[in-house]
């Protein structure tokens, strides 16, 4: 079964920002990742960006700069530009669409008790839906 | 969460039309267009048969210009497909689908199951 897997990073350097990681463990092609906060797509979550893998990308504020890392990751930075820091407490989303066959989307958050330059391990909440 | 379901489809004689419908629910989707796309037995997916996005602008892919029409009822929620001198080779799984545009291209981000569509005598 396809997985997906969600990181949050807080910058050793500027505790103001951010950088989700996202990747898709499983076979096929992804034709479209989606990356929100607040809650998974279509869920109350706030969409953050958009990746397609040959068209480009397009994202929304507070995010600074979506890429893709190989094929199959890709990853989000922030800016937060709020005196105290909402990323910490927040839930990031990423859903990865195969279509047709389907879309594989999981959450992750920086643990309350990170040291900034550490990633939050990878321990996603698979959120399963067969399209 | 997003749910887009078909309806519509069936068998036709070569010359026949169908009228395929997209009911959506759930419909907290973000993006910024919907469209039908179809994949025909032992191929891949076509890009975007019939596509229309926020702004109304629809594009049409060549092989059914003139003789598919797209069309949307928001207060109903629903996306349609008129289909008109069909042929054989328009046979093949239709996926009613809301995604995002790049460059003009709408990228399925949600779909449905599809609907099957035979063009058979």
């Known amino acids: 079964t396809p997985e997906v897997w969600v990181q949050v990073q807080m910058e050793a350097t500027e505790l103001s920002s951010f950088t989700v990681h996202c990747g898709f463990l499983g076979p096929g092609s992804i034709s479209l990742v989606t990356v929100s906060w607040g809650g998974p797509d279509g869920a109350g979550g706030t969409k953050l960006a958009v990746l397609h893998p040959e068209l480009g990308t397009r994202q929304w504020a507070p995010a600074r700069q979506a890429r893709w890392e190989t094929q199959s990751s890709i990853s989000l930075a922030l800016e937060d530009s709020g005196a105290s820091s909402p990323f910490a407490n927040t839930t990031f989303c990423c859903k990865f669409a195969s279509f047709p066959e389907g879309s594989w989307e999981s959450c992750g958050s920086l643990p309350p008790s990170s040291d900034p330059g550490l990633s939050a391990p990878p321990t996603p909440v698979p959120i399963l839906r067969a399209d | 969460e997003v749910q887009l379901v078909e309806s519509g489809g069936g068998l036709v004689q070569p010359g026949g039309s169908l009228r395929l419908s997209c009911a959506a629910s759930?419909?907290?989707?973000?993006?910024?267009?919907m469209g039908w796309f179809r994949q025909a037995p032992g191929k891949g997916l076509d890009e975007g048969v019939a596509?229309?996005?926020?702004?109304?602008?629809?594009k049409y892919a060549d092989s059914v210009k003139g003789r598919f029409t797209i069309s949307r009822d928001n207060a109903k929620n629903s996306l349609y497909l008129q289909m008109n001198s069909l042929r054989a080779e328009d046979t093949a799984v239709y996926y009613c689908?809301?995604?995002?545009?790049?460059?003009?291209?709408?990228?399925?981000?949600?779909w449905g199951q599809g609907t099957q569509v035979t063009v058979s005598s």
């Open positions: 759930g419909f907290t989707f973000s993006g910024d267009c």
């Open positions: 596509t229309i996005d926020n702004a109304g602008r629809i």
């Open positions: 689908a809301a995604g995002w545009t790049f460059g003009g291209q709408c990228s399925p981000a949600d």
